[in-house]
């Protein structure tokens, strides 16, 4: 069947998901549409211990995460909510800002060298985390 | 021998509609992104379409956008390309070619020899 | 979209010359490059990806270096099945790869 049973070559597995860590950089929705091409989409961040796994693996290297305001308020690539979700933003941030004289705010999400979250400018070529989750079918436990 | 082998091609009038197939074999198909590059005569190479190796997301060029249609068959091993409202300038050799991705990089590793579509009057 | 210029288009060339192929991207790409080989007739080859990442069964006189705008294709000690057209291309822009416009080599 198409069920995702376990992960891909090169992926890791952490809590009935998949991950891939890259280690060269895009843009924010270059990295975005490689993870959607991987049937994947860019890391969403839903707990302190899914925070502390991929921090554990990228080290302190800016790296894009699937959280963004391009279209207004923040959200995450694959429709968890914002809102009532986990947050690890470094203090003052996000803080749109307008000063790095490249065009425009920051409405990009992406862990920082010490974990915490900034926004950032789109186009930055930074590290990226894909997630995808193995399939709920493949999760139930065998008929005895 | 691992193999793409393209299909469907031939003449057809502006505004017509064709199907182009690349049936696979040999490999992992369903495991690999794949993609539709044409070539028109004498001239580059352009990029079309591509399609994730599970068929969940869909990309195009925005010379295409709109009229052409990229979809694969995993359990037949087979991509398509369905061309509507065609035009002149997509008179090409049109080669399915799966994606190569490594480290985060990104190429194309297998082609098929390719299939000629004109667009004439 | 990311433009890709290639020189020079053409060049005649011997048997056993050393030959280099120059790729120019519109933007930095990092090192996001491949070159193809393509053959009258025939569907185009990978060579090298990753800018200086030799593809498995490729023969060890083709190499590519560069990174940021600029790249090349070395061919060290032309053989006669190297005669054909070669193509850059960026993978930065994922999906939107775009190519080059080919560079011609043939026999002097």
């Known amino acids: 069947g198409s069920e995702r049973t376990c992960c891909p070559v090169n992926w890791v597995e952490h809590e009935r998901s998949c991950y891939w860590f890259s280690r060269s950089g895009k843009a924010w929705a270059d990295a975005d549409n490689y993870c959607r091409l991987e049937d994947a989409h860019l890391v969403v961040v839903t707990s302190w211990e899914e925070q502390k796994f991929v921090q554990h693996h990228i080290g302190p290297v800016n790296t894009w995460m699937g959280l963004h305001d391009q279209n207004g308020p923040w959200k995450w690539v694959d429709g968890t909510d914002y809102e009532t979700g986990f947050k690890n933003w470094r203090p003052e941030q996000p803080d749109d800002w307008y000063g790095h004289g490249l065009g425009g705010g920051e409405d990009c999400a992406h862990f920082t060298d010490d974990g915490r979250w900034n926004d950032d400018v789109c186009q930055r070529p930074y590290r990226w985390v894909c997630e995808t989750e193995l399939d709920k079918a493949s999760q139930e436990p065998p008929l005895l | 021998e691992v193999q793409l082998l393209e299909s469907g091609g031939g003449l057809v009038q502006p505004g017509g509609s064709l199907r182009l197939s690349c049936a696979a074999s040999e490999f992992t198909f369903s495991s690999y992104a794949m993609s539709w590059v044409r070539q028109a005569p004498g001239t580059g190479l352009e990029w079309v379409s591509i399609i994730s190796g599970r068929g969940g997301n869909t990309f195009y060029a925005d010379s295409v956008k709109g009229r052409f249609t990229i979809s694969r068959d995993n359990s037949k091993n087979t991509l398509y390309l369905q061309m509507n409202s065609l035009r002149a300038e997509d008179t090409a050799v049109y080669y399915c070619a799966s994606r190569l991705a490594v480290a985060g990089s990104e190429a194309f590793d297998i082609w098929g020899q390719g299939t000629m579509v004109t667009v004439s009057s | 979209d990311i433009q890709m210029t290639q020189s020079p288009s053409s060049l005649s060339a011997s048997v056993g010359d050393r030959v280099t192929i120059t790729c120019r991207a519109s933007?930095?790409?990092?090192?996001?490059l491949n070159w193809y080989q393509q053959k009258p007739g025939k569907a185009p080859t990978l060579l090298i990806y990753?800018?200086?990442s030799l593809q498995s069964g490729v023969p060890s006189r083709f190499s590519g270096s560069g990174s940021g705008t600029d790249f090349t294709l070395t061919i060290n000690s032309l053989q006669p099945e190297d005669f054909a057209t070669y193509f850059c291309?960026?993978?930065?822009?994922?999906?939107?790869?775009?190519f080059g416009p080919g560079t011609k080599v043939d026999i002097k």
């Open positions: 990753a800018a200086s």
């Open positions: 933007q930095s790409i990092s090192s996001y």
């Open positions: 291309q960026q993978s930065y822009r994922t999906p939107f790869f775009t």
